[in-house]
C-alpha cells in the first residue's frame, strides 16, 4: 500500500499491494534488450533450471518525476519478461524428453528481489534540498505461482551486498541543492 | 499492512529528557524516512526533523537543533525521538511518521504523550 | 519560516454540504503543499499532496488546488466522518510548517 512507483509524466502511481507496475516504454528511457544487457536465459538442457528458461531482466534507464520535480540523475531499474518454459519438447539432462504441461505448475518470470535507493530530487525554485526512496526490482526469477503470490511481492526484500558511504546532504538553507553522489546511490 | 505503535506516556520534571520510541511492521524501516512532529494541547503540528535509518542522516528543525536525536534499530524496525532539556513548553503529543519522501508523512504512529511539569 | 495562514479556523456545515478550506502561505511555495485530516485523540493522516495529488485510499470527494501562496481544500458532499480538523503543510522550505487547523463540526 505504501510502496509507489514512478512515471515520467509527472504523475505517480500508486499501485496497490503486492503490485509494482511494469513501466511502459517512453520517450526519455533507453532499453537495454534482453539479448544486449539482460541476463542470458538458462541453458535448456540443465534440467534443474528448465523453469528459468528465458526469464529475462530488461534494463530501463529514466529520470523520475515526483510532482514538479526530477530526479537529478536517471536511475535504472529492471522489468521482469519472458516465458518460464515454453510449451514444446524439453530434453532434459540425460538425453529424454520432457514434456511442458500447459496444466502443469504455473511458473512465471516475476520479481525475485527489491532494492530501495534514495533519490535526490530537483524542484523547480525550492530552496530545501528534498529525497524520496523508490522501490526497484533487483533481479528476476521464475517462480512457481501460488494463490498467495500477485504480480510481485511485497516483503521479498533482499539486502543488498554494497553498504553505501554516508555523504553530506545539503544544507537547509542551500538554494538550487546540488544533486549528491552519495545520496544519489544509496541503494540498498 | 503498514503500522507504527509508539511507546506510553512519559511525565517528566524540567531539565530532564524523555526518549519515545516507534515500532515499525509491514515492512523495513529502512526502506523509508522517518519523521518526528508534535502537537500541544489544543495546538497545531509541528515538524521535528526526519532521519533516514539505512544511512543514519537526519535533518532536524531549527527549533530543536541541539536539543533533539532521532535514531534507529534497523534490527528492530524501531525509530527513537530524544528530547532534552525538557520545558513546560515541550508538553505534547509526539508522533512518528514515516514516508518514501523527506517531505511528506504518509503513515502516522497513534502517539505518545509527554507532560513536563515540575 | 514560511508561516501557512489557514481559514476559517472552524466552520459548522451539514452532510451532503460542499466545503472549502484555505490556506494561505506567506511566500510562494509553488505546488509544495500536503493536507492532512485528525480526528480528536486520533493521528493525522494524509489526504493530498503537491497540492492536489489524491493520497493513496482517500476518496475522490477530497480534492485539492492551488499554486504560489494560495491553496484549496475541497470537500465536495461532506459526509459523517469527515468531520475532523484539516491542516495544510507546506515543504518548500525548511523547516516544512503546518497551519493551524480548520475544524469542521457538524451543523
Known amino acids: 500500500q505504501g510502496w509507489q512507483a514512478f512515471r515520467n509524466d509527472a504523475t505517480e502511481v500508486i499501485p496497490g499491494l503486492g503490485e509494482y507496475p511494469e513501466p511502459p516504454p517512453e520517450n526519455n528511457q533507453t532499453m537495454n534488450r534482453a539479448e544486449n544487457g539482460g541476463r542470458p536465459p538458462h541453458h535448456p538442457y540443465d534440467a534443474k533450471d528448465v523453469s528459468e528458461y528465458s526469464c529475462r531482466e530488461l534494463h530501463y534507464t529514466r529520470f523520475l518525476t515526483d510532482g514538479p520535480c526530477r530526479s537529478a540523475k536517471p536511475v535504472t531499474e529492471l522489468v521482469c519478461s519472458g516465458q518460464c518454459g515454453p510449451a514444446r519438447l524439453l530434453p532434459n539432462a540425460i538425453g529424454r524428453v520432457k514434456w511442458w504441461r500447459p496444466n502443469g505448475p504455473d511458473f512465471r518470470c516475476i520479481p525475485d528481489r527489491y532494492r530501495a535507493q534514495r533519490v535526490q530530487l530537483l524542484c523547480p525554485g525550492g530552496a530545501a534540498p528534498r529525497s524520496r526512496k523508490v522501490r526497484l526490482v533487483a533481479s528476476c526469477k521464475c517462480k512457481r505461482l501460488t494463490r498467495f503470490h500477485n504480480q510481485s511481492e511485497l516483503k521479498d526484500f533482499g539486502p543488498e551486498t554494497a553498504r553505501p558511504q554516508k555523504g553530506r546532504k545539503p544544507r537547509p538553507g542551500a538554494r538550487g541543492a546540488k544533486a549528491n553522489q552519495a545520496e544519489l546511490e544509496n541503494a540498498y | 499492512q503498514v503500522q507504527l505503535v509508539q511507546s506510553g506516556a512519559e511525565v517528566k520534571k524540567p531539565g530532564a529528557s524523555v526518549k519515545v520510541s516507534c515500532k515499525v511492521s509491514?515492512?523495513?524501516?529502512?526502506?523509508?524516512?522517518q519523521h518526528w512532529v508534535r502537537q500541544a494541547p489544543g495546538k497545531g503540528l509541528e515538524w521535528m526533523g526526519w532521519?533516514?535509518?539505512?544511512?543514519?542522516?537526519?535533518e532536524y528543525a531549527s527549533k530543536f537543533q541541539g536539543r533533539v536525536t532521532m535514531t534507529e534499530d534497523t534490527s528492530t524496525d524501531t525509530a527513537y525521538m530524544e528530547l532534552s532539556s525538557l520545558r513546560s513548553e515541550d508538553t505534547a503529543v509526539y508522533y512518528c511518521?514515516?514516508?518514501?519522501?523527506?517531505?511528506?508523512?504518509?503513515?502516522w504512529g497513534q502517539g505518545t504523550t509527554v507532560t513536563v511539569s515540575s | 519560516d514560511i508561516q501557512m495562514t489557514q481559514s476559517p479556523s472552524s466552520l459548522s456545515a451539514s452532510v451532503g454540504d460542499r466545503v472549502t478550506i484555505t490556506c494561505k502561505a506567506s511566500?510562494?511555495?509553488?505546488?509544495?503543499v500536503a493536507w492532512y485530516q485528525q480526528k480528536p485523540g486520533k493521528a493525522p493522516k494524509l489526504l493530498i499532496y503537491?497540492?492536489?495529488t489524491r493520497w493513496t485510499g482517500v476518496p475522490s470527494r477530497f480534492s485539492g488546488s492551488g499554486s504560489g501562496t494560495d491553496f484549496t481544500l475541497t470537500i465536495s458532499s461532506l459526509q459523517p466522518e469527515d468531520f475532523a480538523t484539516y491542516y495544510c503543510?507546506?515543504?518548500?522550505?525548511?523547516?516544512?510548517?503546518f497551519g493551524g487547523g480548520t475544524k469542521v463540526e457538524i451543523k
Open positions: 511518521a514515516t514516508g518514501h519522501t523527506t517531505y511528506k508523512f504518509d503513515f
Open positions: 509491514g515492512f523495513p524501516i529502512k526502506h523509508h524516512f
Open positions: 532521519s533516514d535509518p539505512e544511512i543514519g542522516d537526519t
Open positions: 511566500q510562494d511555495v509553488h505546488t509544495a
Open positions: 503537491w497540492a492536489s
Open positions: 503543510q507546506q515543504y518548500s522550505d525548511y523547516h516544512w510548517t
